[in-house]
């Protein structure tokens, strides 16, 4: 029986060009975490395996960094990064737990101020 629950950062926002940490935490179970997969919609971003360590998908290597912990850091954010992210915890003996995070990437306040307060 699966008793665990995934806690996530929920809905988060970040500025374009900035970075954000995607974090999930599995609680209320003694199951062994064997692997965590990170997905963005239908794309595999990264995998953290208990034996093999981290694998970052080559197409995301420039902008995705492993950690902290089992989390994932997204860098140099663009508006195209807006969307759903999933942490998929593979555990033994429970099975699979999935957490969801929604990220909204906003135009930076610097850019907004630059547009509003132009020097004549």
């Amino acid at each position: 029986m699966m008793t665990g629950t995934i806690e996530t950062t929920g809905n988060i926002s970040a500025e374009k060009g900035g970075s954000i940490i995607l974090q999930c935490h599995l609680s209320s179970t003694t199951a062994q975490v064997t692997q965590v997969n990170w997905e963005q919609q239908d794309q595999l971003l990264a995998i953290c395996n208990a034996d093999l360590g981290w694998h970052i998908s080559p197409s995301f290597k420039d902008r995705v960094a492993p950690g902290p912990g089992l989390g994932l850091t997204l860098q140099s954010l663009t508006v195209n990064d807006t969307g759903e992210y999933f942490c998929i915890y593979h555990t033994y003996p429970d099975g699979t737990y999935t957490g969801r995070i929604f990220l909204e990437v906003l135009e930076s306040s610097v850019a907004e101020h630059g547009a509003r307060f132009q020097i004549p």
Epitope: E39, D42, Q43, L44, N49, D51, L52, H55, H90
Partner: antibody, heavy 118, light 107 residues
């Protein structure tokens, strides 16, 4: 250099048994999930079974469930496939494959032929 | 079980041609899709993993794309050594399943 070497294939009568081995070298065997995949003569690839690294959890195709057992001996860097109650339709080349992150199969052995016939 | 349907089952092409092979899953498999090349009497060889990642040592003329249910393997300029059979495989869930294969023959 990663190497996988299967052995144990041969001719066996229907209802008989066979144990295949896959000797691994060139990598930390205990860290990787491993799989068996077979290919009947002139046919496509069919997954047979997989075994996880840390937990030893095993998974099977419906066609072999209850008859085949996948196992591993990390101290000997060897993967096994115990095949019982063999049928003519089990005739195939059997490959072992390394399965990093249980997502892809990056190295394959050369295969061993199992023929089930009377 | 997830069914993988490959098309075409065979094709004839010339050296230098651009070749496209498609693979469709019976349900969404995210990007858990791999492509293998197999030559007669040899073991399969991994070309593309996780839908679009090129395996180390594989020539860049091979590329993969797609997500969800529809995937494509493209060979940008077919070389003599590329005449072989190609298989897709899903690793989204067990049982792991392969497509029926696409045989690329010389025209």
């Amino acid at each position: 250099e990663v190497q996988l070497l299967e052995s144990g294939g041969g001719l066996v009568q229907p209802g008989g048994s066979l144990r295949l081995s896959c000797a691994a070298s060139g990598f930390t065997f205990s860290s990787y999930a491993m799989s068996w995949v077979r290919q009947a003569p002139g046919k496509g690839l069919e997954w047979v079974a997989s075994i996880k690294s840390s937990t030893g959890t095993s998974y099977y195709a419906d066609s072999v469930k209850g008859r085949f057992t996948i196992s591993r001996d990390n101290s000997k860097n060897t993967l096994y496939l115990q095949m019982n109650s063999l049928r003519a339709e089990d005739t195939a080349v059997y490959y072992c494959a390394r399965e990093p992150y249980s997502v892809w199969m990056d190295y394959w052995g050369q295969g061993t032929l199992v023929t089930v016939s009377s | 079980d997830i069914q993988m349907t490959q098309s075409p089952s065979s094709l004839s092409a010339s050296v230098g041609d651009r070749v496209t092979i498609t693979c469709r899953a019976s349900q969404s498999i995210s990007s858990y899709l791999n492509w293998y090349q197999q030559k007669p009497g040899k073991a399969p060889k991994l070309l593309i993993y996780a839908a679009s990642s090129l395996q180390s040592g594989v020539p860049s003329r091979f590329s993969g794309s797609g997500s969800g249910t529809d995937f494509t393997l493209t060979i940008s300029s077919l070389q003599p050594e590329d005449f072989a059979t190609y298989y897709c495989q899903q690793s989204y869930s067990t049982p792991l399943t392969f497509g029926g294969g696409t045989k690329v023959e010389i025209k």
